[in-house]
């Protein structure tokens, strides 16, 4: 859970209590044990742009 008073992390990143900052979810592929990766799994990925109107 994100610390009180912290701005929400941008899409594709998640709050790390161990590091006190937002971390890029992309790094979870290489190191899934990181504490913030739980937040990445819960957050939906950035939406794909539709190819039709």
């Amino acid at each position: 859970e994100q610390a009180p008073g912290q701005a929400p992390c941008s899409r594709g990143s998640s709050w790390s209590a161990d590091l006190d900052k937002c971390m890029d979810c992309a790094s979870c592929r290489a190191r899934p044990h990181s504490d913030f990766c739980l937040g990445c799994a819960a957050a939906p990925p950035a939406p794909f742009r539709l190819l039709w109107p």
Partner: antibody, heavy 120, light 108 residues
Amino acid sequence: EVQLLESGGGLVQPGGSLRLSCAASGFTFSPYPMIWVRQAPGKGLEWVSYISPSGGSTHYADSVKGRFTISRDNSKNTLYLQMNSLRAEDTAVYYCARGGDTYFDYFDYWGQGTLVTVSS
Amino acid sequence: DIQMTQSPSSLSASVGDRVTITCRASQSISGYLNWYQQKPGKAPKLLIYQASSLQSGVPSRFSGSGSGTDFTLTISSLQPEDFATYYCQQSYTSPFITFGQGTKVEIK
């Protein structure tokens, strides 16, 4: 110049308590994760505990969990290790070390160490 | 827990020798491997981080390589000040880190 200076070590009886300090200077202390690592006489390095930059997140080795408490005072640029219920196997030189500034992948600065001897 | 095993535990070498120390992880740790040098009575000193990156101020005769489970620290031409104990450390499971048991480099 980055410096980490441990203090508080000494001789203590089994079951006793000790509080180690690590005074940081030469850098802005508050953004960095910190750890304690120990080294028993003639042995290798053993990670003991970790604390996040704010102090809000802490982790411990199984060997010290429930007995040791890591904390920090960023206003005083100081890291602490409260050691309770000490055992003979806790006898070691205790080092504090600074984590890397982007992640805690490595520990780039270490103190000179303080010796803790647990003996009756 | 991830175990780190170094080999050899000790070695004897002469000034000018090329020295290689290996570190094996009990499971893949990608490239999250660091090397430290420790001299008697002194604190460990970071040499190599993330398997192959040379820490600032460390002589270029030190190099690191490897990924997955097998890693090496190489000293291309051993100098008198290099006689020490070397430790590997995995940070794949940071902040729960583990060290190898150490390799002592002695004078032949």
